[in-house]
């Protein structure tokens, strides 16, 4: 959010310096031009750090449904299918923006909110703490 | 995104059935109560499918800066530090919501946009296509 000099074609705003409350058009524009942008959909099973996806729904949030990753194992899966506990499966987390209805149940008033979601898992070498 | 019976404490809206344009408060509420929400910040180096982070900036977008992951190798890093090309490093992608200034340069008018971002990488077993 940056204050940009007013353009005559812009909707009017009470706060001329820095908009705190803005108008947002909820007709989503999808910039993913690829016919199939979500090719990662089977990685959760094929990864050496596989994960399950859990459905999280909150009607007061937009989007109301978010699928969260939870790593299946503490360790990582080896080629023979066994779990190697010398390695760690860890969630890759990302902070995302969502809209939260505010006041609650209001259909046309939201507040931006940052939430941390786990998108998938990756296999990492553990940090070994040596005791002196 | 639902038409909810108007609550007397709600801001007024032109569209009573289904809000297309809504008011959004840009004072971000951060629901990440953890003191260090970016725990995964060193995973990009320790992962068997390590990645680099590239800065993507767009002043017409909110947030204007997004960090994108690019996998360092086609294969995955073994315990000895060599790359195993029998496995694949692949990006974990997620569709996220951003705000796009619309009309361009307007400080207080946005449109929701979905973009696909690579959050990190994971090591997967390749799909082998057998030729008959």
């Amino acid at each position: 959010g940056i204050a940009i000099p007013r353009n005559s074609g812009c909707p009017n705003s009470e706060d001329k310096n820095f908009p705190r409350t803005v108008m947002v058009n909820l007709n989503i524009h999808n910039r993913n031009t690829s016919t199939n942008p979500k090719r990662s959909s089977d990685y959760y099973n094929r990864s050496t750090s596989p994960w399950n996806l859990h459905r999280n729904e909150d009607p007061e949030r937009y989007p109301s449904v978010i699928w969260e990753a939870k790593c299946r194992h503490l360790g990582c899966v080896k080629a023979d299918g066994n779990v190697d506990y010398h390695m760690n499966s860890v969630p890759i987390q990302q902070e995302i923006l969502v809209l939260r209805r505010e006041p609650r149940h209001c259909p046309n008033s939201f507040r931006l909110e940052k939430i941390l979601v786990s998108v998938g898992c990756t296999c990492v070498t553990p940090i070994v703490h040596h005791v002196a | 995104g639902i038409a909810i019976p108007r609550n007397s404490g709600c801001p007024n809206s032109e569209d009573k059935n289904f809000p297309r344009t809504v008011m959004v408060n840009l004072n971000i509420h951060n629901r990440n109560t953890s003191t260090n929400p970016k725990r995964s910040s060193d995973y990009y180096n320790r992962s068997t499918s390590p990645w680099n982070l590239h800065r993507n900036e767009d002043p017409e977008r909110y947030p204007s800066v997004i960090w994108e992951a690019k996998c360092r190798h086609l294969g995955c890093v073994k315990a000895d530090g060599n790359v195993d090309y029998h496995m694949n490093s692949v990006p974990i992608q997620q569709e996220i919501l951003v705000l796009r200034r619309e009309p361009r340069h307007c400080p207080n008018s946005f449109r929701l946009e979905k973009i696909l971002v690579s959050v990190g990488c994971t090591c997967v077993t390749p799909i082998v296509h057998h030729v008959a």
């Epitope: 942008p37 996806l53 459905r55 449904v65 | 038409a3 289904f18 979905k114």
Partner: antibody, heavy 123, light 106 residues
Framework: EVQLVQSGAEVKKPGASVKVSCKAS????????VHWVRQAPGQGLEWIGV????????AYNQKFEGRATLTADDSTNTAYMELRSLRSDDTAVYYC????????????????WGQGTLVTVSS | EIVLTQSPDFQSVTPKEKVTITCSAS?????MHWFQQKPDQSPKLWIY???NLASGVPSRFSGSGSGTDYTLTINSLEAEDAATYYC?????????FGQGTKLEIK
């Protein structure tokens, strides 16, 4: 026009498996979950589970956990519901229905349904 | 699992009459959806999020309620309203439906 077109009726023996397909058109497949609901003859509706075609995420009614498998192929915009170890009380019409993940003009409810697939389990 | 109990199971009604169908949940739910189903047809979304009419639903229908008690009301019944109506919750897993209320026109 939004359409969910399901595969044709099936007759199966007890212990067998059935796989019902649901081809979606008229909307972006990965913007909506696909839920599966069944209805035994003369009975009410029973929720089986949900799949998000974008992430592959699934959630099942515990009653069907381990026996039902939901999958989706986003290259053909088709969702599938496989039910194994069929019993006579699995005889029902199986419906697929979509549920919005994003705003659009959707009511966050099962707003479009397939025509249903009758699965008959009989020896 | 949340059990939804509809009342009545069956109702025979005269055109123009006011009809009320109730749906009682065994635990509190956020919202209730209602579906209409006619013989040999798929269910149709009728009322979503407790009180919002789905596209094409006549204004004689309304929905209300909160917590454990929800209601679908038809102000002045018409012949085309003969169908089975189901309530549905999705506040907790598994999502559940009521047993249905069959409306017949006298």
């Amino acid at each position: 026009e939004v359409q969910l077109v399901q595969s044709g009726a099936e007759v199966k023996k007890p212990g067998a498996s059935v796989k019902v397909s649901c081809k979606a058109s008229g909307y972006t497949f990965t913007d909506y979950e696909v839920h599966w609901v069944r209805q035994a003859p003369g009975q009410g509706l029973e929720w089986i589970g949900v799949i998000d075609p974008g992430t592959g995420g699934v959630a099942y009614n515990q009653k069907f956990e381990g026996r039902a498998t939901l999958t989706a192929d986003d290259s053909t915009n088709t969702a599938y519901m496989e039910l194994r170890s069929l019993r006579s009380d699995d005889t029902a019409v199986y419906y697929c229905t979509r549920y919005s993940l994003f705003y659009g003009s959707s009511p966050y409810a099962m707003d479009y349904w397939g025509q249903g697939t009758l699965v008959t389990v009989s020896s | 699992e949340i059990v939804l109990t509809q009342s009545p199971d069956f109702q025979s009604v005269t055109p123009k009459e006011k009809v009320t169908i109730t749906c009682s949940a065994s635990s509190s739910v956020n919202y209730m959806h209602w579906f209409q189903q006619k013989p040999d047809q798929s269910p149709k979304l009728w009322i979503y999020r407790t009180s919002n009419l789905a596209s094409g639903v006549p204004s004689r229908f309304s929905g209300s309620g909160s917590g454990t008690d929800y209601t679908l009301t038809i102000n002045s019944l018409e012949a085309e309203d003969a169908a089975t109506y189901y309530c549905q919750q999705r506040s907790s897993y598994p999502w559940t439906f009521g047993q249905g209320t069959k409306l017949e026109i006298k």
